[in-house]
């Protein structure tokens, strides 16, 4: 059936707690005001409506919920907790809704939630327990399979006095709740580094997108545990070279495809191993597009066309001959 728009909504009180009791029984499949609903598609869309809260009277059948382009600002604990619970909700899209605060337990009481998209929200305050719901050292497993967190970095003046990377990673690792996560997208977040423990604790990952960040090196990152990894997006970062350890780990992943376009590769003597590896590997997609950025004399040279004679390092002068 085509989406139907509800004119006015007269439904339940659903506070941010699972224990909420309705003020009056909601009509079972009523569509909230300002939303469009299709029961056949099990879909509710409340898009670009300047909502400041999650609608309280969501129909119990909802499987796909789009709350994009709103002004939610904060997701409190139990923001989607309803009585009865939204037991079918599997895909939740909150992108571009001006969220800057996601509290502990914001997604509790959603037993079927498999896909969550929080992209394009300036998340200055992402609780470590946003996805685990509990501060226990080991939480109940989250049902999440896909977590999309592209462009969630707040403007610099709104960032707290802590590492943004650290805040995000704490939420990913808390309580080991996301052991079943298969897709993680963290593109466009100004990440300078990837904390070394994050990937080891997400063993089910199939797809990891770290494109359009500011990663300079992968030296301390281990991909060894990610035996199911199928795609690794590292385009548009600040990578200068991949070292032997990383190359060997990537080569050892049975299903992997790696995307490395648009990084400022430094084509000096440290690049020799990577060039050799690139010539042999089938892992890198579009490897013929990779070009040198530095030094100046090597700019725009195709990595696959280089040989060892091209890859030299300027000799280090003894201190007595160095000039300031």
């Amino acid at each position: 059936s085509s989406p139907t728009s509800s004119a006015s909504s007269f439904s339940s009180s659903a506070p941010f707690l699972a224990s909420a009791v309705s003020a009056q029984p909601p009509l079972p499949d009523q569509c909230p005001a300002l939303c469009e609903c299709s029961e056949a598609a099990r879909t509710v869309k409340c898009v670009n409506r300047n909502l400041t809260e999650v609608p309280t009277d969501l129909p119990a059948y909802v499987r796909n919920l789009f709350l994009t382009g709103n002004q939610l600002a904060v997701l409190p604990a139990g923001a989607f907790a309803r009585r009865p619970p939204l037991a079918e909700l599997a895909a939740l899209n909150l992108s571009g809704s001006r969220l800057d605060e996601v509290r502990a337990g914001a997604f509790e009481h959603l037993p079927s939630l498999r896909q969550l998209d929080l992209s394009h929200n300036p998340l200055a305050d992402l609780s470590p327990f946003a996805f685990s719901g509990s501060n226990a050292s080991v939480s109940a497993p989250s049902p999440l399979v896909e977590l999309i967190l592209n462009h969630i970095v707040p403007p610099e003046d709104e960032r707290q006095n802590r590492s943004f990377e650290g805040m995000v990673v704490a939420a990913l690792l808390a309580g080991r709740a996301l052991q079943g996560l298969r897709r993680l997208e963290l593109a466009s977040n100004h990440f300078l580094y990837l904390p070394r423990d994050v990937l080891a604790q997400l063993p089910s990952l199939r797809h990891l997108d770290l494109s359009n960040n500011s990663l300079v090196s992968l030296t301390y990152v281990s991909f060894r545990n990610l035996t199911h990894l199928e795609s690794l997006h590292l385009e548009d970062n600040a990578l200068k070279v991949l070292h032997n350890g990383t190359l060997a780990e990537l080569q050892g992943l049975p299903h992997i495809r790696v995307f490395l376009d648009n990084n400022p590769w430094v084509c000096d003597c440290h690049m020799a191993d990577m060039v050799t590896w690139l010539k042999e590997t089938e892992v890198v997609q579009g490897k013929d597009r990779l070009t040198c950025a530095y030094p100046e004399k090597m700019r725009n040279r195709v990595l696959l066309e280089l040989n060892s004679a091209d890859l030299d390092c300027d000799p280090i002068l003894p201190p007595s001959l160095q000039t300031s």
Epitope: P15, R49, T52, E53, P55, T56
Partner: antibody, heavy 120, light 111 residues
Framework: EVQLVESGGGLVQPGGSLRLSCAAS????????MHWVRQAPGKGLEWVSY????????YYADTVKGRFTISRDNAKNSLYLQMNSLRDEDTAVYYC?????????????WGQGTTVTVSS | DIVLTQTPLSLSVTPGQPASISCRAS??????????LHWYLQKPGQPPQLLIK???NLESGVPDRFSGSGSGTDFTLKISRVEAEDVGVYYC?????????FGQGTKLEIK
């Protein structure tokens, strides 16, 4: 000038019903969430209920849940509170108040209040 | 529910003297993004009026002798020089979660 004017209060017996209204003017009513707050005689302030700007969200204090229903008509710039199964302890001055959002908001404009007396 | 406890419950101040009211929350009502604590004054026979939003932001039209501070669980409303028109009951209120709750009120009178 922002104005909120409550009406509909009065004397009612326990178990009875009343419908309060709040007429808004001087601002774009449909852009704001609205609350009801009450004040029992000689007592402090108690939040009662909230409705979002587009009637997508409704919240109630536990003391009134299941008995009171908040609603609004943006075309008429009006807010309502349907009060059923009234009790002695519902006796209070009822204020409507404006907010820009539920959690990130505050009560930045108040009506003068309407008095509800529940007594046999 | 979050309980807000105000102290003192009443105070009597000489005009021109400062006054201070404390509001303590039973749990934190601050995040790194926002402080969910607001202050109101209810003058005799009138509805409440907003004085301070988000702990420290003066509402438009409110005299700058009023100021607010605090975060987490402890908040303070200060009046630098009390005037006769400041009499009434002062309330703090949180908007951290449902239900929204108010402090029990602090009655200010003039000596």
């Amino acid at each position: 000038e922002v104005q909120l004017v409550e009406s509909g209060g009065g004397l009612v017996q326990p178990g009875g019903s009343l419908r309060l209204s709040c007429a808004a003017s001087g601002f774009t009513f449909s852009n704001f969430g609205m609350h009801w707050v009450r004040q029992a005689p000689g007592k402090g302030l108690e939040w009662v209920s909230y409705i979002s700007s587009g009637s997508t969200s409704f919240y109630y204090a536990d003391t009134v849940k299941g008995r009171f229903t908040i609603s609004r008509d943006n075309a008429k710039n009006s807010l309502y509170l349907q009060m059923n199964s009234l009790r002695d302890e519902d006796t209070a001055v009822y204020y409507c108040a404006r907010t820009n959002s539920l959690l990130r908001g505050f009560f930045d404009a108040w009506g003068q209040g309407t008095t509800v007396t529940v007594s046999s | 529910d979050i309980v807000l406890t105000q102290t003192p419950l009443s105070l009597s101040v000489t005009p021109g003297q400062p006054a201070s009211i404390s509001c303590r929350a039973s749990q934190s009502v601050s995040s790194s993004s926002y402080t969910y604590l607001h202050w109101y004054l209810q003058k005799p026979g009138q509805p409440p009026q907003l004085l301070i939003k988000s702990a420290s932001n003066l509402e438009s039209g409110v005299p700058d002798r009023f100021s607010g501070s605090g975060s987490g669980t402890d908040f303070t409303l200060k009046i630098s020089r009390v005037e006769a028109e400041d009499v009434g009951v002062y309330y703090c209120q949180h908007s951290w979660e449902i239900p929204l709750t108010f402090g029990q009120g602090t009655k200010l009178e003039i000596k």
